[in-house]
Each structure stands twice: as structure tokens, then as C-alpha cells.
């Protein structure tokens, strides 16, 4: 398994080598 | 062996403050995010949010913005829920589990939170 | 947001035969060529447990009878044989959209 998972589904994808932590590997950008 | 555990059953009173505790044990903190997962009365599985691990960065659903904190102590392995101004609608089970590149893979035991006069 | 719609919500199954749950999202979970939709069991008093993760992969130490299918929007989850011990409630979970969405449960009954 992946020695590192911080999201889980969308929040793990990377699109365009940018990390998705904050939301960019999902549909819906959410921010707190 | 990978665990979670949860700090135990809270009751409160309407308009105070609960912080839940889960520490995990048995792999890197840092490394995997922690999700929070409330279960209501009825059974009904509702996702929070998650804290990153690593920044400490927490990202909240829209259900759960403004009352409710996801907090560390990395030193400790801990993550922290904090529910602020409790009211009736907060009373559930709650779970923290780490985050899998698909799903959520291992969970905490659960903290029940009863809120009451 | 993304439903997950599950059925039956409850359902009893002779030991031995085969049971199956359906999940029907309102938007499709597939990305990239991947589902992003998990199956959990939960007894009670218990946390929910991973069974099965992007829609056919079975979790490290869950018995081979547990097996999922789909894509899209349309999945099941079949556990043939069933056991004593897989009495409990089944949920599915969509991963693919911010917020991830739960189905509302099956609860499975072995007669």
C-alpha cells in the first residue's frame, strides 16, 4: 500500500502536478 | 497493529463546547489524514471533513462549517474534534478514521455525544 | 451533493445463499477510469469496517465470499456464501465529490 495517503478519493488526485490537499482533485472546490 | 482510539461518551448541556480525541497508533500520523465521520440517532453515516496530517490543514463539509474544529497534536498522534454551542441536532456518534487512497480504512470506536438539560 | 440510494433497506437470507445490495448514485463516481465508491459493514456497538474499496477491490483480510460490481452509477455488493457472521448493516460510500456521501444502510438478516 502507499507509504502516504493524507486525502482520501478526490482529495488525493493530483491534476496538472498540483497537490490536491486542498481540493483541486475534486468536482467541487470546498475550502474551510 | 493500526489503531484508533477515542476518547469516551460526552454529555453536555445545550450551548456548550465538546472536544473529542483520537489518537492513532500502529503507523506514521503524519503520513495518513484523519476523516471525521458523524453517525446520527437514526444510523445515518454523515462525512465531516479531514485534517491533513502533515500541514494540519483541515477542510470541512458544508453541513459541518462554523461550529466545528478539526485540530492536532502530531506530537502526541492526536487529532481533535471540537463542537462549539452544542444543540440537540450534534447528538450522534462520532468517528475519526484515516484516510485510504479510495475510502476510509481504519476507524475509531466512536464517541457518543448526548445533549441535554 | 452526490445520493447514494440504497437497496433493499433491510433484507434476510437463508445460510449459505447468495445476498445482494444495491447502490445507485445520482451522478457517476467514475474517474479516470476508476469507481470511487467503498462498502462498509457495521455491526452494532461496532464501527463501520472497509470491505470493499473502488468498487471491486477487496480489503486486505476480508473473506473472498464479500465480491462488488459496477461502474457509473450503478453498483451491487454480493456475499455468497452467506454466514452467520455477516449479519450486520451494509453501507456504500461515494469518494469521487466533495462532500463523500454514505448510502443509507442495508441491513442483512440470515435466517
Known amino acids: 500500500s502507499p507509504k502516504m495517503v493524507q486525502g482520501s478519493g478526490c482529495f488525493g488526485r493530483k491534476m496538472d502536478r498540483i497537490s490536491s490537499s486542498s481540493g483541486l482533485g475534486c468536482k467541487v472546490l470546498r475550502r474551510h | 497493529q493500526i489503531q484508533l482510539v477515542q476518547s469516551g461518551p460526552e454529555l453536555r448541556k445545550p450551548g456548550e463546547t465538546v472536544k473529542i480525541s483520537c489518537k492513532g497508533s500502529g503507523y506514521t500520523f503524519t503520513h495518513y489524514g484523519i476523516n471525521w465521520v458523524k453517525q446520527t440517532p437514526r444510523k445515518d453515516l454523515k462525512w465531516m471533513g479531514w485534517?491533513?496530517?502533515?500541514?494540519?490543514?483541515?477542510i470541512y463539509a458544508d453541513d459541518f462549517k462554523g461550529r466545528f474544529a478539526f485540530s492536532l497534536e502530531t506530537s502526541a498522534n492526536t487529532a481533535y474534534l471540537q463542537i462549539n454551542n452544542l444543540n440537540n441536532g450534534d447528538m450522534g456518534t462520532y468517528f475519526c478514521?484515516?484516510?485510504?487512497?479510495?475510502?476510509?480504512?481504519?476507524w475509531g470506536q466512536g464517541t457518543s455525544v448526548t445533549v441535554s438539560s | 451533493d452526490n445520493v447514494l440510494t440504497q437497496s433493499p433497506p433491510s433484507l434476510a437470507v437463508s445460510l449459505g445463499q447468495r445476498a445482494t445490495i444495491s447502490c445507485k448514485a445520482s451522478?457517476?463516481?467514475?474517474?479516470?477510469?476508476?469507481?470511487?465508491l467503498n462498502w462498509y459493514q457495521q455491526k452494532p456497538g461496532q464501527p463501520p469496517k472497509f470491505l470493499i474499496y473502488a468498487a471491486s477491490n477487496l480489503e486486505s483480510g476480508i473473506p473472498a465470499r464479500f465480491s462488488g460490481s459496477g461502474s457509473g452509477t450503478d453498483f451491487n455488493l454480493n456475499i455468497h456464501p452467506v454466514e452467520e457472521e455477516d449479519a450486520a448493516t451494509y453501507y456504500c460510500?461515494?469518494?469521487?465529490?466533495?462532500?463523500?456521501?454514505f448510502g443509507s444502510g442495508t441491513k442483512l438478516e440470515i435466517k
Open positions: 478514521t484515516r484516510s485510504h487512497r479510495f475510502g476510509l480504512d481504519y
Open positions: 485534517i491533513n496530517t502533515h500541514t494540519g490543514e483541515p
Open positions: 451522478q457517476s463516481v467514475d474517474y479516470n477510469g476508476d469507481s470511487y
Open positions: 460510500q461515494q469518494s469521487n465529490e466533495d462532500p463523500f456521501t
